[in-house]
């Protein structure tokens, strides 16, 4: 978790002098509770936005927006703590809005935004906005949270972001798989414009079951420049196992930008349809 471009982050707006500070996610009001604390944020909204760094890279960011409730507690509102927790790693990053002037009611509802938390493809985050000071131990909570799921690199808008392109999102192998005679599969896919090797991972399963009955790995050497964007054809020999008929073919590239961690593409061949042939009725009935 990180902030996009650590340039001057702004939270000031007409009628409010405000500064954005790094936060340890442990505000002083936890340790030294105050008697009077503000109410919770209203209408917390999160959207996926896209922002360019100064270097020109494009990153997905969480756009966080919330409003204040129209009650007298804004007189005691000293700022806000924004927290983003990545759920699969428990990594947390916080920033603090520090109000340098007192808030006053005005003709419009106070609204705040922040769009500098960089998020990763296919990750889920808990986004929390805490009004400061935080409540006393038994006080009503004054925060709002939402769990936010970021689309993966298959998503059309995500595909062109720097982290997705680095993992090979622009490569479309257009995999085709056909079953040949004599227990063979023919796999065909389009090579990318990089001289790097590929791996085909074949996993076979029985019909309607999820434990594999056959696994095979096939190495494809790095293509020459004149082979870039051409189709590569590989014939794989299957184990002659009756019922081991559903095949998943996965292609793993090893691009220089992502090495062992590139996006994989897969295709599946289903088991052949079994014709519903009725049991043959014998011409005669045996008597024994």
């Amino acid at each position: 978790l990180r902030l996009l471009d650590h340039r001057a982050l702004v939270c000031s707006q007409p009628g409010l002098n405000c500064t954005v500070k790094n936060s340890t996610c442990l505000d002083d009001s936890w340790i030294h509770p105050r008697n009077l604390t503000p109410s919770s944020p209203k209408d917390l909204q999160i959207q996926l936005h896209f922002a360019h760094t100064q270097q020109g890279d494009l990153f997905p960011v969480a756009h966080i927006e919330w409003t204040l409730q129209t009650d007298a507690s804004i007189l005691y509102l000293e700022g806000a703590e924004l927290s983003v927790l990545q759920l699969n790693t428990n990594e947390r990053l916080c920033v603090r809005f520090e109000f340098l002037s007192k808030l006053r009611h005005h003709h419009r509802r106070w609204r705040f935004t922040f769009s500098h938390f960089v998020v990763d493809p296919d990750q889920e985050y808990e986004v929390t906005v805490h009004h400061l000071p935080k409540p006393i131990p038994d006080g009503d909570p004054n925060h709002q949270s939402k769990n936010f799921l970021v689309p993966d690199c298959e998503h059309a808008r995500m595909k062109v972001t720097t982290p997705c392109m680095s993992s090979g999102s622009l490569w479309d192998p257009n995999i085709t798989v056909e079953t040949l005679e004599a227990h063979q599969l023919r796999v065909s896919f389009t090579l990318w414009n990089e001289s790097t090797h590929y791996q085909i991972l074949l996993t076979s399963f029985p019909h309607m079951e999820n434990h594999s009955c056959f696994e095979h790995m096939h190495h494809i050497p790095a293509p020459r420049p004149e082979e870039f964007h051409q189709r590569s054809n590989v014939t794989l020999t299957l184990r002659n196992l009756k019922g081991c008929c559903r095949h998943q073919v996965q292609i793993q590239p090893f691009f220089s930008s992502c090495l062992n961690d590139c996006l994989r593409h897969s295709a599946t061949v289903s088991c052949p349809e079994m014709p519903d042939t009725p049991e043959p009725i014998p011409d005669y009935m045996p008597l024994w």
Epitope: L149, E154, H155
Partner: nanobody
Framework: EVQLVESGGGLVQPGRSLRLSCAAS????????LHWVRQAPGKGLEWVSG????????DYADTVKGRFTISRDNAKNSLYLQMNSLRAEDTALYYC???KGLGYCRGGSCSYFDYRVQGTLVTVSS
């Protein structure tokens, strides 16, 4: 202009099933998370179920969990809600709703919903 048109509602007996459909147009359907929300007579809007852009994630309100199933067909720009074991308390106007922004939030909207004040009426009564 975002268009969301629901269909499939009707009068049904308790314990029976219905399948709601929502035809969408006016936006890139496959980019957005979608939801079903409902409004019972004299009540406020209640979130029912949500589905992420690629159907990789589905969530349900506790009141419908195990009975309702949300699905989508990005090729047909359509959203569905399969409702089984219907109860009298499921009687409501059902709306399909599009997330205003990209991304998906568990248990409701991340930002505001786009939906049309049309809906399809489901009445569960014996």
């Amino acid at each position: 202009e975002v268009q969301l048109v629901e269909s499939g509602g009707g009068l049904v007996q308790p314990g029976r099933s219905l399948r709601l459909s929502c035809a969408a147009s006016g936006f890139t359907f496959a980019d957005y998370a979608l939801h079903w929300v409902r409004q019972a007579p004299g009540k406020g809007l209640e979130w029912v179920s949500g589905i992420s852009w690629n159907a990789g994630r589905k969530d349900y309100a506790d009141t419908v969990k195990g009975r309702f199933t949300i699905s989508r067909d990005n090729a047909k720009n359509s959203l569905y809600l399969q409702m089984n074991s219907l109860r009298a308390e499921d009687t409501a106007l059902y709306y399909c709703a599009k997330e205003k922004g990209l991304g998906y939030c568990r248990g409701g909207s991340c930002s505001y919903f786009d939906y049309r004040v049309q809906g399809t009426l489901v009445t569960v009564s014996s």
